[in-house]
């Protein structure tokens, strides 16, 4: 599910105000207000099974919701690739694929999903409390990732509720590109809202409801978004490779993280369920876009073992060519 | 110059194991994955497996498993292939091959390491 | 595992031929296709990376094309120098896996 602005319906503006705000600014609202209300934030899900047949065997599978074109996916173990994660798979919409152990096999499922599945034997093999996270870089979104674990409770064969503990972070390339436009547009919006709202208007009928102000906190991050910008990832690992620092950010700036509840209701049972649409991370675009301009000095992310990601604005097709020079 | 210089030729007993070396210079060892790759009968190629020496990171073909073991030696620029229980199966040609992982690619091979299994 | 089929086992050409030689894949590899050269004695070399990328140093007489499950290599005006085995590598898929080989010889 697309996580969207949601706008209550507009009411046309009053003839009194078409000659005070001027009819190209009366224009330009219902068009930046279209690209806000249709410009969903992308997501990230992450799915934890353990089979049945082998107890210590794990299968996560990611997806991105997005309409943008994935140029990399990483996964990690153990938190965030960059902030105490381990890389297991590196995945390239057009390259291919290098991965590591435990990982068997990493595999793409669909043009925006993976899957990958890991071993269960052996010193690095992983356990039930062990967080796997996802990282789908794309254009022009940016970077997404979410993480997930299987709860220590759950059945072999059962997998865990998808992405339990999200990680919303979204990178400069995609922030300051469609993304970054779409949000001075609403930004703007919003600025023209609240003039209009606090403009004298006698020609409005008192019987008449205002609908600016339920416009004007349609953009407010909601309290669990401003919640999330100060929760750091913390992972305690006791029984699982690989060890896991107390609290990690990743590299070159803060990390903003939301914590989401599991609800009984989310949690597939049995096979149908393996096979249903995973429930994706909802989170707002405000609380992921406030944290990034402190990262404008960072070096493109690394993205795996000997990895270094070079976004290109033109896509994964763009990158079947050398990427920069080394 | 980038340079991959591989150990000599070994001539081993059918169940013993022995130890290759790719000694590495003109880069950094550690921008670099390694992979190890066995040509036989001086035709056909087998990737064996990979190594990532930031962190020892291993990856292998599951046919090699158990049969090979990818090590680094990161102050000395050196990455290491052992091979054990070895069968007349296992005489062939080792490379080791750097990985360049911005074009995807085995970019340099090593001088390669001809290993004889005879009793 | 992805098989590399390289059905031209040995091909007989002449100096200044033009020759293309190919290699198929048994599932979609986008353009997860590496190229190497090995003269006899010699370690393989890098010669196209990508499907069509040449490496440093590679002549421009080498061009590799295709996309998916059909992948070519073309050597235009031949040199004595470029007799050899040619062998395709995927890294769609693990394992990587190599094509059989085609050598180069004269008629």
């Known amino acids: 599910m697309r996580t969207e602005a949601q706008v209550p319906a507009l009411q046309p503006p009053e003839p009194g105000l078409e000659g005070a705000m001027g009819h190209r600014t009366l224009v330009l609202p219902w068009v930046l207000l279209t690209l806000c209300v249709t410009a969903g934030t992308p997501e990230v899900w992450v799915q934890v099974r353990m089979e049945a047949t082998e107890l210590s065997s794990f299968t996560i599978r990611c997806g991105f919701l997005g309409s943008g074109s994935i140029s990399l996916v990483t996964v990690s173990w153990g938190g965030p690739n960059g902030a105490g994660g381990t890389t297991l798979a590196v995945l390239h919409p057009e390259r291919g694929i290098r991965q590591w152990a435990p990982a068997r096999q990493a595999r793409w499922e669909t043009q925006s999903s993976i899957s990958l599945i890991l071993e269960g034997s052996g010193a690095s093999s992983p356990c039930a409390n062990t967080t796997f996270c996802c990282k789908f870089a794309s254009f022009p979104e940016g970077s997404w990732e979410a993480c997930g674990s299987l709860p220590p409770s759950s059945d072999p064969g059962l997998s865990a509720p998808p992405t339990p503990a999200p990680i919303l972070r979204a990178d400069l390339a995609g922030i300051l590109g469609v993304s970054g436009v779409l949000l001075f547009g609403c930004v703007y919006l919003l600025h023209l809202l609240r003039r209009h709202k606090h403009r004298p208007a006698p020609r409005l009928q008192p019987s008449r409801t205002s609908p600016q102000a339920p416009r004007a906190r349609a953009w407010a991050p909601s309290q669990a978004s401003q919640a999330a910008l100060h929760v750091p990832y913390a992972t305690i690992n006791t029984s699982c490779r690989p060890a896991t620092l107390d609290t990690a950010h990743p590299h070159g700036g803060p990390s903003w993280w939301a914590s989401l509840p599991t609800h009984a209701a989310h949690r597939p049972q049995g096979p149908a369920a393996w096979a249903s649409t995973p429930i994706p991370a909802r989170g707002s675009f405000v609380s992921v876009e406030n944290g990034l301009y402190a990262q404008a000095g960072e070096r493109p992310p690394h993205t795996g073992p000997g990895l270094t990601l070079f976004p290109d604005p033109r896509g994964p097709r763009a990158m079947e060519g050398p990427l920069g020079v080394r | 110059e980038v340079q991959l210089q591989q150990s000599g030729p070994e001539l081993v007993k059918p169940g013993s194991l022995v130890k290759i070396s790719c000694k590495t210079s003109g880069y950094t060892f550690t921008d670099y994955n390694m992979d190890w790759v066995k040509q036989s009968h001086g035709k056909s190629l087998e990737w064996i497996g990979a190594i990532d020496p930031k962190n020892g990171a291993t990856s292998y073909n599951q046919k090699f498993k158990g049969k090979a073991t990818l090590t680094v030696d990161k102050s000395s620029s050196t990455a290491y292939m052992e091979l054990r229980s070895l069968t007349s199966e296992d005489s062939a040609v080792y490379y080791c091959?750097?990985?360049?992982?911005?074009?995807?690619?085995?970019?340099?091979w090593g001088t390669g390491t001809t290993v004889t299994v005879s009793s | 595992d992805i098989v590399m089929t390289q059905s031209q086992k040995i091909m007989s050409t002449s100096v200044g031929d033009r020759v293309s030689m190919t290699c198929k894949a048994s599932q979609n590899i986008r353009s997860a296709v590496a190229w190497y050269q090995q003269k006899p004695g010699q370690s393989p070399k890098a010669l196209i990376y990508l499907t069509s990328n040449r490496h440093t140093g590679v002549p421009d007489r080498f061009t590799g094309s295709g996309s998916g499950t059909d992948f070519t290599l073309a050597i235009s005006d031949l040199q004595s120098e470029d007799l050899a085995d040619y062998f395709c590598?995927?890294?769609?898929?693990?394992?990587?896996?190599f094509g059989g080989g085609t050598e180069l010889e004269i008629k």
């Open positions: 091959a750097r990985w360049d992982s911005n074009y995807w690619y085995f970019d340099v």
């Open positions: 590598l995927q890294h769609w898929n693990y394992p990587y896996t």
